[in-house]
């Protein structure tokens, strides 16, 4: 195979590349968890980064009593559907419009029982750590909102003053699913083979999934002078020599300073 | 796309009648629902009477006895007849339809709109 690479040893440098790493005839492409010229480093850093938004979808169910069941609200592509989900969507609209997590309404089914509405209120907030708790509160807030609007609207003498008017005892809500997004699952998943030395911490509110070889974080490892590694077993110090020291210790924080050494030997030879 | 047109208003003395029509082209009229509103000046708009396909009726209370709504399917058009007429009844008269058997005087339920034509009863 020719490359473009230049020096000695060149020539092999395709068959070199490890963990995975592919010659593009001028040099090592790296897959995502590597670096180096070999991809032989073990990166510090994965992008995990979260989806701006997270969604959650409720199944509900309520029965309208202000429209009469005609087959035609069966077919998807009918007039007659197409004017009930315009009229069922703007009275959502209005129901659920105190609730920022609120994105709107999919009727999945119309069935007879005066109508009985099968739907889905879809709920979006953006990504935090706390994003739970905030779909949760809302998924609260749209079943006080369907409850009350569905025994406060409702028909007197077959006559509905509202918008649309429902059945009271017809609201239930079937399912809810929030989209799943788990950082250290992701981390643990990314990192592979070492997935047990990366962790998830937050800055900003974004999650960083990184070993202890990242600098500024709480659990970065101090290699001082020296550079940290990432092995099989772990993150590890590799200490440097200067012109003037030799750095030693699980954190190359031991100097010993060359001359001190060099004149113990002769001393002693 | 559906249009209704609405026509027969005018000026007309307390006690005098006027019979208004609607003519609709764009869907199958023997189907959904079918009103006549009214709104004054400076008042909401108001549900006056009301029909459905499956021969539901509704009036307002200030217009029973007095309005009959009536539709003819062979010429798309429906009715209001308006007799012993009051200077409350001044307004501007819409039709409204839908294609959905409704069962609510509330107008943001109804999808199609006339124009609208005036009624004013004065003497």
């Known amino acids: 195979r020719t490359t473009t690479c230049f020096g000695d040893g060149c020539q092999n440098t395709a068959s070199r590349c490890k963990n995975g790493g592919t010659w593009d005839g001028l040099k090592c492409q790296c897959p995502n968890l590597y670096y180096g010229e070999l991809c032989e480093e073990v990166v510090s850093s994965i992008d995990i980064g979260p989806p701006e938004t997270i969604s959650a979808q409720m199944e509900l169910t309520v029965t309208v009593t202000s429209v009469k069941f005609t087959e035609e609200l069966k077919n998807h592509s009918s007039q007659e559907f197409q004017e009930f989900k315009q009229t069922f969507t703007e009275q959502m609209n209005i129901v659920y419009s105190g609730i920022p997590e609120y994105v709107g309404v999919n009727i999945t089914k119309l069935r007879l029982g005066s109508v009985v509405v099968e739907h889905d209120v879809l709920l979006r907030t953006k990504y935090t750590p706390e994003y739970k708790t905030v779909l949760d509160n809302a998924t609260e807030v749209v079943k006080e909102k369907i409850t009350k609007v569905t025994t406060q609207q409702i028909m007197i003498n077959d006559i509905c003053s509202d918008m649309m008017c429902f059945n009271t005892t017809g609201t239930q809500v079937q399912n809810i699913t929030v989209t799943q997004y788990d950082p250290e699952e992701d981390c643990r998943k990314m990192a592979k083979e070492y997935g047990d030395y990366f962790v998830v911490e937050y800055r900003d509110q974004k999650p960083y999934c990184i070993s202890p070889c990242e600098p500024g974080f709480s659990v970065s490892k101090n290699c001082n002078l020296g550079k940290c590694q990432m092995s099989l077993s772990g993150p590890q110090c590799l200490c440097v020599t200067t012109e003037t020291h030799w750095y030693s210790g699980e954190t190359c924080n031991q100097g010993t300073q060359k001359s001190l050494v060099y004149g113990h030997h002769h001393h002693h030879h | 796309e559906v249009q209704l047109v609405e026509s027969g208003g005018g000026v007309v003395q307390p006690g005098g009648s006027l019979r208004l029509s609607c003519a609709a082209s764009g869907f199958t009229f023997s189907r959904g629902s079918w009103g006549w509103f009214r709104q004054a000046p400076g008042k909401e708009r108001e549900a006056v009477a009301l029909i459905s396909s499956d021969g539901w009726t509704f009036y307002a209370d200030s217009v029973k006895g007095r309005f009959t709504i009536s539709r003819d399917n062979s010429k798309n058009t429906l009715y209001l007849q308006m007799n012993s007429l009051r200077a409350e009844d001044t307004a501007v008269y819409y039709c409204?339809?839908?294609?959905?058997?409704?069962?609510?005087?509330?107008?943001?339920?109804?999808?199609?709109w006339g124009q609208g034509t005036m009624v004013t009863v004065s003497s």
């Open positions: 409204a339809a839908s294609v959905l058997v409704l069962r609510t005087l509330n107008p943001k339920a109804w999808h199609h």
